[in-house]
């Protein structure tokens, strides 16, 4: 029974995983892998940390939070449908059979062709200006009247990033968290 997380194609996906270090800087090795957690380590490792730093990573996978404070949540950049599946976060706490493992299910949805109303509201809340658009010639390139130097692609990306950051904060409360020591 994995906890399920969602993202759209082209977005950054966020998979939460946390622990509380016994003391500041007293880090615990962590691995992230694609596929359910096996008995040992992670299968198909995409990122790994030791007691000091990230010591192995692959492209598009990174730790956006402060892993030195125990935030080992995984960010997957620019996801595709192939990124769907189970991911394993394993916190390798020293001792006999002490490590904690969490299976998180990532569901990737196709990108929406047109922005949903909720996304428009999100952006309006972040930028409370009149969002009128005007066409420019046959190509119908659309820009915001009040922000003439920002195109819709940039706005959509910005809106996604804003939403991602809010989502990250929301998920922090529901993510896998353990306390050590």
């Amino acid at each position: 029974s994995e906890v399920e997380y969602r993202a759209e194609v082209g977005q950054n996906a966020y998979l939460p995983c946390f622990y509380t270090p016994a003391a500041p800087g007293n880090l615990v090795p962590v691995c992230w892998g694609k596929g359910a957690c096996p008995v040992f380590e992670c299968g198909n490792v995409v990122l790994r940390t030791d007691e000091r730093d990230v010591n192995y990573w692959t492209s598009r996978y990174w730790l956006n939070g402060d892993f030195r404070k125990g935030d080992v949540s995984l960010t997957i950049e620019n996801v595709t449908l192939a990124d769907s599946g189970i991911y394993c976060c394993r916190i390798q706490i020293p001792g006999i059979m002490n490590d904690e493992k969490f299976n998180l299910k990532l569901v990737i949805k196709p990108a929406k062709v047109t922005p949903a109303p909720t996304r428009q509201r999100d952006f309006t809340a972040a930028f409370p200006r009149m969002l009128t658009t005007r066409g420019h010639g046959p190509a119908e390139t659309q820009t915001l009247g009040s922000l003439p130097d920002i195109n819709l692609t940039q706005i959509s990306t910005l809106a996604n990033e804003l939403r991602d950051s809010r989502l990250a904060n929301d998920l922090r409360d529901s993510g896998a968290t353990i306390r050590i020591g």
């Epitope: 008995v39 299968g43 706490i93 020293p94 059979m97």
Partner: antibody
Framework: EVQLVESGGGLVRPGGSLKLSCAAS????????MHWVRQAPEKGLDWIAY?????????????YYADTVKGRFTISRDNAKNTLFLQMTSLRSEDTAMYYC?????????????WGQGTSVTVSS | QIVLTQSPAIMSASPGKKVTLTCSAS???????LYWYQQKPGSSPKLWIY???NLASGVPARFSGSGSGTSYSLTISSMEAEDAASYFC?????????FGGGTKLEIK
């Protein structure tokens, strides 16, 4: 070339102790988890213990044991000396076997990809 | 714990014949964590197949692996003398990791 060489086996009385060693070379030992697996004469393979990489200090390792050896065997490692250990106490006749150390590959195979040649342990009075 | 049952325990095959060894699990095993090892008398085991169907380095292409859930198999498309050995399946999907009892494959 990856090499694992076990030593320390021999004949021991029931209730006795023995410490096995596994010297590793040809790879960054501190970066890999390690296993001990045994094989009784003419029998199958029996996993007994695992220790995670503990890449900076051996005290940082996560350890797993088979129920059959829990409380009697202790797995440890010395990353500075590229050596894996298995301290065996309260030995029983059923512990008689060839003992192998094996590397746990996490980079692609997720398996015990290299094994030593083994060291023989005989528990008999 | 997951019990892996291999069959047959012993079998012999003529050169050129197709051989299939089976490994049955008492409960479901993730195909990513199902392996086969080859062992010859007096030698240590060698990783032969990993993640159900991937051949380890140096393993001849006549070998293949397949399966899912509780049923797995190793197949040799055309038996050769050097294939005579014991083959063990192994799972590390759930604790404790376990091995099958092995199949001893002999050449006729």
């Amino acid at each position: 070339e990856v090499q694992l060489v076990e030593s320390g086996g021999g004949l021991v009385r029931p209730g006795g102790s023995l410490k096995l060693s596994c010297a590793a070379s040809g790879f960054t030992f501190s970066d890999y988890g390690m296993h001990w697996v045994r094989q009784a004469p003419e029998k199958g393979l029996d996993w007994i213990a695992y220790i995670s990489s503990g890449s900076i200090s051996s005290g940082s390792s996560t350890i797993y044991y088979a129920d059959t050896v829990k409380g009697r065997f202790t797995i440890s490692r010395d990353n500075a000396k590229n050596t894996l250990f298995l301290q065996m106490t309260s030995l029983r006749s059923e512990d008689t076997a060839m003992y192998y150390c094996a590397r746990h590959d996490w980079r692609g195979l997720y398996a015990m990809d290299y094994w030593g040649q083994g060291t023989s342990v005989t528990v008999s009075s | 714990q997951i019990v892996l049952t291999q069959s047959p325990a012993i079998m012999s095959a003529s050169p050129g014949k197709k051989v299939t060894l089976t490994c049955s699990a008492s409960s479901s095993v993730s195909s990513s964590y199902l392996y086969w090892y080859q062992q010859k008398p007096g030698s240590s085991p060698k990783l032969w197949i990993y993640s159900t169907s991937n051949l380890a380095s140096g393993v001849p292409a006549r070998f293949s692996g397949s399966g899912s859930g509780t049923s797995y198999s190793l197949t040799i498309s055309s038996m050769e003398a050097e294939d005579a050995a014991s083959y063990f399946c192994h799972q590390s999907s759930s604790y404790p990791p376990t091995f099958g009892g092995g199949t001893k494959l002999e050449i006729k």
